[in-house]
Interface confidence: medium
């Protein structure tokens, strides 16, 4: 069964700057990745970035840099200042659309006791939805 993992990390250099990493553990080819915060996309969450293998990347504040890390994983850096910046308990969700598996989404947030610059290794997060 495909799985999605989500890792949220606070940067040591900027205490309110976050890096979100997400990956898809499946054999299909990824056609779209959507990163949102505040909940799943389409269920109260707000889109931060959309990554498409051919059409490129679109991002909205507070996203600062979204990029592909591998063919099946992405990273997103969030700017660390301003009223729309994330806080420690913000939930981030990643939705991967792949063929032939369909859409898989998981969410994660900063571990409660994480030190700046540290984070738990990326482990599969609970799958919230499979379309």
């Amino acid at each position: 069964t495909p799985e999605v993992w989500v890792q949220v990390r606070m940067e040591a250099t900027e205490l309110s700057s976050f890096t979100i990493r997400c990956g898809f553990l499946g054999s299909g080819s990824i056609s779209l990745v959507t990163v949102s915060w505040g909940g799943p996309n389409g269920a109260g969450g707000t889109t931060l970035a959309v990554l498409h293998p051919e059409r490129g990347i679109r991002q909205w504040a507070p996203a600062r840099q979204a990029r592909w890390e591998t063919q099946s994983s992405i990273s997103l850096i969030l700017e660390g200042s301003g009223a729309s910046s994330p806080c420690a308990n913000t939930t981030f969700c990643c939705k991967f659309a792949s063929f032939p598996e369909g859409s898989w989404e998981a969410c994660g947030s900063l571990p409660p006791s994480s030190d700046p610059g540290l984070s738990a290794p990326p482990t599969p997060a609970p799958i919230l939805r499979a379309d």
Epitope: T47, E79, G82
Partner: antibody, heavy 123, light 111 residues
Framework: EVQLQQSGAELVKPGASVKLSCTAS????????IHWVKRRPEQGLEWIGG????????LYASKFQDMATITADTSSSTAYMQLSSLTSGDTAVYYC????????????????WGQGTSVTVSS | DIVLTQSPASLVVSLGQRATISCRAS??????????MHWYQQKPGQPPKLLIY???NLESGVPARFSGSGSGTDFTLNIHPVEAEDAATYYC?????????FGGGTNLEIK
């Protein structure tokens, strides 16, 4: 010439649904986002949502997430917006608009607009 | 959501004079050297028309008497010299984050 042709005026009853269309010509609909914007009488403009027709990816304002459904048919160069559970507050002119050609430079400005579709919700 | 406050709500300007419309954002709409603020003109019975994108870039086909400036939270649309056909409602719109929002509009009357 770039054009967005919208469907005609609609008179619908409260609680009903309506589906508006926006047909593009003069450009490839797959090269852009198509957005929908609401203008109520004597009020300003409100962004409802948008779609990337090439891949079907949609974006919505949270206010409209439950009532608006945006789709596109690239074969006919047409974008659609369905509005459900309509109330008198949804009486408005609805515009579709083309975003500047898809680009990582993040313009997100709407450079061509349809003529608007008037929707009246009344019993 | 970012709130855009336009002022004045209405403006009367003599033909050939300068019209200045202000748009203030509730937080900065500038990042990485870009200001994600755009200006539109709307006449009665017509759809909005893009005038200025990214704060200061004149849209193709728009007369050079229109100009935009500003960064951060404060932006200005200038029209000089004003012509009779400029009578319309003007809106600012940001696109820095989702959802994009519009200002309340400024109604420009020419005398």
């Amino acid at each position: 010439e770039v054009q967005l042709q919208q469907s005609g005026a609609e008179l619908v009853k409260p609680g009903a649904s309506v589906k508006l269309s926006c047909t593009a010509s003069g450009f490839n609909i797959e090269d852009t986002y198509i957005h929908w914007v609401k203008r109520r009488p004597e009020q300003g403009l409100e962004w409802i949502g948008g779609i990337d027709p090439a891949i079907g990816n949609t974006l919505y304002a949270s206010k409209f997430q439950d009532m608006a459904t945006i789709t596109a048919d690239t074969s006919s160069s047409t974008a659609y917006m369905q509005l459900s559970s309509l109330t008198s507050g949804d009486t408005a002119v609805y515009y579709c608009a083309r975003e500047r050609v898809y680009s990582n430079t993040l313009y997100y400005a709407m450079d061509y607009w349809g003529q608007g579709t008037s929707v009246t919700v009344s019993s | 959501d970012i709130v855009l406050t336009q002022s004045p709500a209405s403006l009367v300007v003599s033909l050939g004079q300068r019209a200045t419309i202000s748009c203030r954002a509730s937080k900065s709409v500038s990042i990485s050297g870009y200001s994600y603020m755009h200006w539109y003109q709307q006449k009665p019975g017509q759809p909005p028309k893009l005038l200025i994108y990214l704060a200061s870039n004149l849209e193709s086909g728009v007369p050079a008497r229109f100009s935009g400036s500003g960064s951060g939270t404060d932006f200005t649309l200038n029209i000089h010299p004003v012509e009779a056909e400029d009578a319309a409602t003007y809106y600012c719109q940001h696109s820095r984050e989702l959802p994009p929002t519009f200002g309340g509009g400024t109604n420009l009357e020419i005398k």
